[in-house]
C-alpha cells in the first residue's frame, strides 16, 4: 500500500499479480513528485494497492473504471 511522504502518498513496490476486477471500486495516480509512477487501486474493503501502470492488466482496469 502507498506510504505518505510529506502528505503525498507514494508507492515503493508494485503488485504484479492481477487483482480481481470485481473487488476494485476506484483508482488514483500517485503524485509526479513520487520517485516511482504508480496507480493505486482501492478495493471494496478500502484497501489501497500499488500497481505498475505499465502492466497490461493495470491499463485494462483503468480503462474499464473510466468507462463505468
Amino acid at each position: 500500500s502507498p506510504h505518505a511522504s510529506d502528505t503525498t502518498p507514494c508507492c515503493f513496490a508494485y503488485i504484479a499479480r492481477p487483482l480481481p476486477r470485481a473487488h476494485i471500486k476506484e483508482y488514483f495516480y500517485t503524485s509526479g513528485k513520487c520517485s516511482n509512477p504508480a496507480v493505486v487501486f482501492v478495493t471494496r474493503k478500502n484497501r489501497q494497492v500499488c500497481a505498475n501502470p505499465e502492466k497490461k492488466w493495470v491499463r485494462e482496469y483503468i480503462n474499464s473504471l473510466e468507462m463505468s
Epitope: I15, A16, R17, P18, L19, P20, R21, A22, H23, T43, K45, R47, V49, K55, K56, W57, E60, Y61, S64
Partner: antibody, heavy 119, light 109 residues
Framework: QVQLVQSGAEVKKPGASVKVSCKVS????????MHWVRQAPGKGLEWMGG????????IYAQKFQGRVTMTEDTSTDTAYMELSSLRSEDTAVYYC????????????WGQGTTVTVSS | SYVLTQPPSVSVAPGQTARITCGGN??????VHWYQQKPGQAPVLVVY???DRPSGIPERFSGSNSGNTATLTISRVEAGDEADYYC???????????FGGGTKLTVLG
Amino acid sequence: QVQLVQSGAEVKKPGASVKVSCKVSGYTLTEFAMHWVRQAPGKGLEWMGGFVPEDGETIYAQKFQGRVTMTEDTSTDTAYMELSSLRSEDTAVYYCATDPLYEGSFSVWGQGTTVTVSS
Amino acid sequence: SYVLTQPPSVSVAPGQTARITCGGNNIESKSVHWYQQKPGQAPVLVVYDDSDRPSGIPERFSGSNSGNTATLTISRVEAGDEADYYCQVWDSNTDHWVFGGGTKLTVLG
C-alpha cells in the same frame, strides 16, 4: 528456496468430500497468492480458485462455486482445498501453485495429489 | 468466458525451431504465461508476461504476443523439450485464470 509439499493420494466414494493440504516452506503463506489447479487423466490444466492476499478474499472458478472451499492455516503455513459432493469426473491430480518469484504467474507448484473417486 | 485455443500437437525434428500458438480474442491486450509439463510431473513456468523468462530457463525459449495470437518459440529443439505446453491468461471479465487446452510437442527421431 520456496517449496510446496502436498498431502498423499486419496481414494473417495461418490458423494464424499476430500481435503488436500499444501505445506509451504521458504516463505510466509500470507505473502503470496495460493491457487489450486486440477488435471483430469489425459486432460489439460483447470484453475479452481485462489487466495488474493491484498484483498483477504478467496476467489473461486464459477464451475466449482459452492462445492470447493480453500482455507489457510497461517500458524503452520499450510493451505487446504476441500472439494465436496465428489463424482467420478473429479478424479484428477490436484496441484497447489503460487507466485513468489514471478508474480502474476504460477512460478512454484506442489508435486500434485492424486484423488480417485470410485464406488 | 475467455477462450484460449492451442493446436493439440506440434512435431519438430531435433535442432529445428518449434512454434506453439495460443489464440484468443485480442490476446495482445493480455499478459500470456507459458508452462511446460512433462509426463507425471508438475508444470514448470517457462515464459511469463508474454516474453520474459524465469531464471534457469534456457534462452532457447522465447515468447511473443500480437493481435489474436501469442506464440511460444523453442529454438534448437532438444529431445528433452518433448512435453505438453500450456498458455495462461487472466480474464478480468470473469476474474478467472484461464488455461489453453495444451499442445503436445513431439521431437521426431
